[in-house]
Interface confidence: low
């Protein structure tokens, strides 16, 4: 017959026949031959491969270095590769988490538009006209000023982005 | 022969203050992460800090924060741990260990012989 | 925090397997080490990273750790393997020891 030229899902062409790929989590030890399977082994400790393949290595599992600031958000198996992720307070600087850095703080005059997470940074927003915020913060949101009518005073000192209005008793009028 | 020694314990009365130190010898010292450990008489291991290789992550159990401050000398190869505000539950033999690799997952592979701290009046 | 808990004690009569149990919450999601202590000496590593023995320590300990549950195994146990055993793991920026499990070899 005549040999085949392409090979069906999950086979690979060598030596002009099909063979079967290795399944997830195991590499490739010996081509098919005429007579033979293809010939595969299950990946060792701290090695995956995660899709169906010839390779004749397995991928080593990622570290996730603590000295980084990293640490295993999920452990790898013989078919997946370990997930890092970042320690409280920090986030990773790219899609593949490599290393970590620490959450950017809003100046005052900025309130926290949105808490970062173990991957996107802290987003600040410049505080509206009525709010204020007079510190350096990962977590806090603009204030609003407060309202010195509420409690019986008038403002004495008006407020700003980064400081709150300063409220005082009222002028009575003398008899 | 990779080691660690241990000095610095003593008798301290409460509320005082103590300098640990922990020599090491027989590997490269910055490239390991190192910890202090301790062990109250009759007790369990209770880990008290750790530092990382480069010296610019410290992390502490909640018992001691505040109050103990994990440092290394690359120049000395030595470890120290100053404790502040001592109490009598700071009372243990006091362990330096070394990671066991990059991996902070190796455990500690190297332990020093211990030095005892005593919290008393 | 986080916790790991040991059964305070176990027997085993020698040249029997001896396990001992370290349990935590979603446990299989990190790596968990293993510690000998004997009286009067300072602690030695015997499983690391789950499962793996460093160079020294001999074949018949082994680790496994899935689930809420790390297990260290020691077959055909010996009189010199009896001894205070303690899991750790490294969690969020800290590290925690299990309270230990005194072996003792009958």
């Known amino acids: 017959p005549e040999p085949p030229t392409a090979c069906r899902e999950k086979q690979y062409l060598i030596n002009s026949q099909c063979c079967s790929l290795c399944q997830p989590g195991q590499k490739l030890v010996s081509d098919c031959t005429e007579f033979t399977e293809t010939e595969c082994l299950p990946c060792g400790e701290s090695e995956f491969l995660d899709t169906w393949n010839r390779e004749t290595h397995c991928h080593q599992h990622k570290y996730c270095d603590p000295n980084l600031g990293l640490r295993v958000q999920q452990k790898g198996t013989s078919e997946t590769d370990t997930i890092c992720t970042c320690e409280e307070g920090w986030h990773c600087t790219s899609e593949a988490c490599e290393s970590c850095v620490l959450h950017r703080s809003c100046s005052p005059g900025f309130g926290v538009k949105q808490i970062a997470t173990g991957v996107s940074d802290t987003i600040c927003e410049p505080c509206p006209v009525g709010f204020f915020s007079n510190v350096s913060s990962a977590f806090e949101k603009c204030h609003p000023w407060t309202s010195c009518e509420t409690k019986d005073l008038v403002v004495q000192q008006a407020g700003t982005n980064k400081t709150d209005v300063v409220c005082g008793p009222q002028d009575r009028l003398r008899a | 022969e990779v080691q660690l020694v241990e000095s610095g314990g003593g008798l301290v009365q409460p509320g005082g203050s103590l300098r640990l130190s922990c020599a090491a010898s027989?590997?490269?010292?910055?490239?390991?992460?190192m910890s202090w450990v301790r062990q109250a008489p009759g007790k369990g291991l209770e880990w008290v800090s750790v530092i990382s290789d480069s010296g610019g992550r410290t992390y502490y159990a909640d018992s001691v924060k505040g109050r103990f401050t994990i440092s290394r000398d690359y120049s000395k190869n030595t470890l120290y741990l100053q404790m502040n505000s001592l109490r009598a539950e700071d009372t243990a033999v006091y362990y330096c260990?070394?990671?066991?690799?990059?991996?902070?997952?190796?455990?500690?592979?190297?332990w020093g012989q211990g030095t005892t701290v005593t919290v008393s009046s | 925090s986080y916790e790991l808990t040991q059964p305070p004690s176990v027997s085993v009569s020698p040249g029997q397997t001896a396990s001992i149990i370290c349990s935590g919450d979603k446990l299989g999601d990190k790596y968990v080490c293993w510690y000998q202590q004997k009286p009067g000496q300072s602690p030695v590593v015997v499983i690391y990273h789950d499962n793996k023995r460093p160079s020294g320590i001999p074949e018949r300990f082994s680790g496994s750790n899935s689930g809420n549950t790390a297990t260290l195994t020691i077959s055909g146990t010996q009189a010199m393997d009896e001894a205070d055993y303690y899991c750790q793991v490294w969690d969020s920026s800290t590290v925690v020891f299990g309270g230990g499990t005194k072996l003792t070899v009958l």
């Open positions: 260990a070394k990671e066991g690799g990059d991996y902070y997952y190796y455990g500690m592979d190297v």
């Open positions: 027989g590997f490269t010292f910055g490239s390991y992460a």
